[in-house]
């Protein structure tokens, strides 16, 4: 009891615990495969602690390993959608600074219309996180069919 | 190791480590889409610390952000199978109190027979969290192809 | 502040924090359905913090609940080259010591190129995981394809 | 057969209030997030407001900002809009329109019903 | 907020015409685009979603296309039941934001 306490008096983000959980916002202009994504509570359930959005991008503000994961399902899909929009894939990179720019997860639609992943994966502060959606079909901007989120684990 | 110690005097429920992972007990009579679980340490490798189960369904005893994580194998299934008896959709939700209801995660099978996936949500205390399988195929019961968790990450 | 500093001086292991990313590094032998892992800050994103590779399958250091996880995309594949080599499948689970052997994950390709899911588990040191994948087809050994790694999340 | 039905308009004096309803069948409600689209007369399509599911995301369009509360009750299969401070530009035929189940379209609509502001 | 034009604001045309209508948003909307039709007294019907998408129930002769700014409403014969008001919207980002209409008249 007296450690949970002493825990209460500390702010949270000395204990490291940057999370972030987004949702859809919308796909980029022509010819930018970005997904954009938006975040906070006047939005549902999506949330930044620590983490920061930049023009739809995740910003991350601690050093750290972090799990990332993505679920993305597409809009007015079927099997037969799928494979004849193939290919239609998924990346989830760092994007800046461009030193540091590398692919973490990358997925293929084939013939389904939902991909899910996740993956632990060093990260450091002012790293930016680019979610990549190319092909021709849309992202539902249902929120509980496409989200991505990161969750710090450790130094 | 002086801290290591003192950690260990402490009970694990005042650090918030509430986890639970389940395994498929049985699916529900007709017109009852939820799937029921079970789990605890004599029913193989599944647990619970903190949540409780509530006939079968999932409670929540600590407020936070989660990691709800499941995968869901359908029994006697191929790609032929499953694009015949499409859709078939799973869906996490709150399902009670009522005022909180809401779909958290939602995944069709297409042309497969398993989907898995996971995602961060804020839960609070009495939270039920139940997962519904729509559709006319049955889930495997096999521990290694079905199971839904969940792991407190922060407050 | 001061926390974030006693914590500095802390051994990070004495609060449990075990987590490892692994990128494959080739398939086993004919008769030998085993993936080999290869991972550290050497061959790019991956990372051994705590477990450890034995003959490239993944050795536990710690007893604990973990979070397991593994994405693996099959090389040179589409959704009729999955079909055409069903059965394709990936199981991850404890293979030694003997005494503990249990599969603790397993998803099959059918029409679909990739496969990705998580679940929690009770590891206990000395437990090596292996992930068989049965079947015609081969990997990629792409770093955003294929991979797998284990997170400690709590005793 | 899907069906969404208005109800509640009719005249009011500026500054007034209203309250109105729309009555779902045919579908799960609660699958759909609902939007509120307006057309004054001779005028054109304006979008006015936008609910969710689990009403934990709500839009507004400027114009009615403020003024106007959306609100459903997923158990009667019901939407509301709650108008007040009412003005002459108000005036309207006002439709509730189901979302499409995977993007922001409106693939059904309700028949209308007509919202007159004067005094 | 995203301004639509539509051109143009109205056309006279005769059965068995092909009409097309254009759509222009004041900065890309990737496919996030809506068509409807309005007839005198009624409520909007969907036609086109996702750009290019027929909406279910809604005859081959109507199609949708274009990406980011420009879009097109092709009607490729013209029918007695299609002379109504047609609608883009965006659903790009909120506000969504409709066209100002274009009306489809017997010549």
């Known amino acids: 009891q007296r450690f949970a306490q002493a825990q209460q008096q500390l702010p949270l983000e000395s204990l490291g615990w940057d999370v972030a959980e987004l949702q859809l916002n919308h796909t980029g202009p022509q010819q930018d495969p970005r997904l954009y994504w938006q975040g906070g509570p006047a939005l549902g359930r999506s949330f930044l602690h620590g983490p920061e959005l930049d023009k739809g991008q995740l910003r991350i503000h601690r050093d750290g390993i972090y799990m990332v994961h993505i679920q993305v399902t597409l809009a007015i899909c079927s099997s037969t959608t799928a494979s004849r929009h193939h290919p239609t894939t998924l990346a989830v990179g760092i994007c800046s600074p461009a030193s540091r720019s590398i692919s973490l997860l990358r997925l293929s639609f084939h013939q389904g219309c939902t991909i899910a992943s996740q993956r632990l994966t060093p990260l450091a502060r002012g790293d930016t996180l680019c979610t990549n959606l190319t092909g021709t079909l849309l992202p539902s901007r249902n929120t509980d069919e496409t989200f991505f989120g990161v969750q710090w684990v450790r130094p | 190791q002086r801290f290591a110690q003192a950690q260990q005097q402490l009970p694990l429920e005042s650090l918030g480590w509430d986890v639970a992972e389940l395994q498929l007990n049985h699916t529900g009579p007709q017109q009852d889409p939820r799937l029921y679980w079970q789990g605890g340490p004599a029913l193989g490798r599944s647990f619970l610390h903190g949540p409780e189960l509530d006939k079968g369904q999932l409670r929540i005893h600590r407020d936070g952000i989660y990691m709800v994580h499941i995968q869901v194998t359908l029994a006697i299934c191929s790609s032929t199978t499953a694009s015949r008896h499409h859709p078939t959709t799973l869906a996490v939700g709150i399902c009670s109190p009522a005022s909180r209801s809401i779909s958290l995660l939602r995944l069709s099978f297409h042309q497969g027979c398993t989907i898995a996936s996971q995602r961060l949500t804020p839960l609070a205390r009495g939270d039920t969290l139940c997962t519904n399988l729509t559709g006319t195929l049955l889930p495997s019961r096999n521990t290694d192809e079905t199971f839904f968790g969940v792991q407190w990450v922060r407050p | 502040q001061r926390f974030a500093q006693a914590q500095q001086q802390l051994p990070l292991e004495s609060l449990g924090w075990d987590v490892a990313e692994l990128q494959l590094n080739h398939t086993g032998p004919q008769q030998d359905p085993r993936l080999y892992w290869q991972g550290g800050p050497a061959l790019g994103r991956s990372f051994l913090h705590g477990p450890e590779l034995d003959k490239g399958q993944l050795r536990i250091h710690r007893d604990g609940i973990y979070m397991v996880h593994i994405q693996v995309t099959l090389a040179i594949c589409s959704s009729t080259t999955a079909s055409r080599h069903h059965p394709t499948t990936l199981a991850v689970g404890i293979c030694s010591p003997a005494s503990r052997s249990i599969s603790l994950l397993r998803l099959s390709f059918h029409q679909g190129c990739t496969i990705a899911s998580q679940r929690l588990t009770p590891l206990a040191r000395g437990d090596t995981l292996c992930t068989n994948l049965t079947g015609t087809l081969l990997p990629s050994r792409n770093t955003d394809e294929t991979f797998f790694g284990v997170q400690w999340v709590r005793p | 057969e899907v069906q969404l039905v208005e109800s509640g308009g009719g005249l009011v004096q500026p500054g007034g209030s209203l309250r109105l309803s729309c009555a779902v069948s045919?579908?799960?409600?609660?699958?759909?997030?609902i939007h509120w689209v307006r057309q004054a007369p001779g005028k054109g399509l304006e979008w006015i407001s936008y609910?969710?599911?689990?009403?934990?995301?709500?839009y507004y369009a400027d114009s009615v900002k403020g003024r106007f509360t959306i609100s459903r009750d997923n158990a009667k299969n019901s939407l509301y809009l709650q108008m007040n401070s009412l003005r002459d530009e108000d005036t309207a035929v006002y439709y509730c329109?189901?979302?499409?189940?995977?993007?922001?379209?409106?693939?059904?609509w309700g028949q209308g019903t007509t919202v007159t502001v004067s005094s | 907020d995203i301004q639509m034009t539509q051109s143009p604001s109205s056309v006279s045309a005769s059965v068995g015409d092909r009409v097309t209508i254009t759509c222009r948003a004041s900065q890309g909307i990737s496919s996030w685009l809506a068509w409807y039709q309005q007839k005198p007294g009624k409520a909007p019907k969907v036609l086109i979603y996702?750009?290019?998408s027929l909406q279910s129930g809604v005859p081959s002769r109507f199609s949708g296309s274009g990406s980011g700014t420009d879009f097109t409403l092709t009607i490729s014969s013209l029918q007695p039941e299609d002379f109504a008001t047609y609608y883009c919207q965006q659903a790009f980002s909120f506000p969504f934001t409709f066209g100002p209409g274009t009306k489809v008249d017997i010549k």
């Open positions: 609910i969710s599911r689990s009403s934990s995301t709500i």
């Open positions: 996702a750009a290019s």
């Open positions: 329109a189901r979302d499409h189940a995977q993007w922001y379209g409106m693939d059904v």
């Open positions: 045919g579908f799960t409600f609660s699958n759909h997030n």
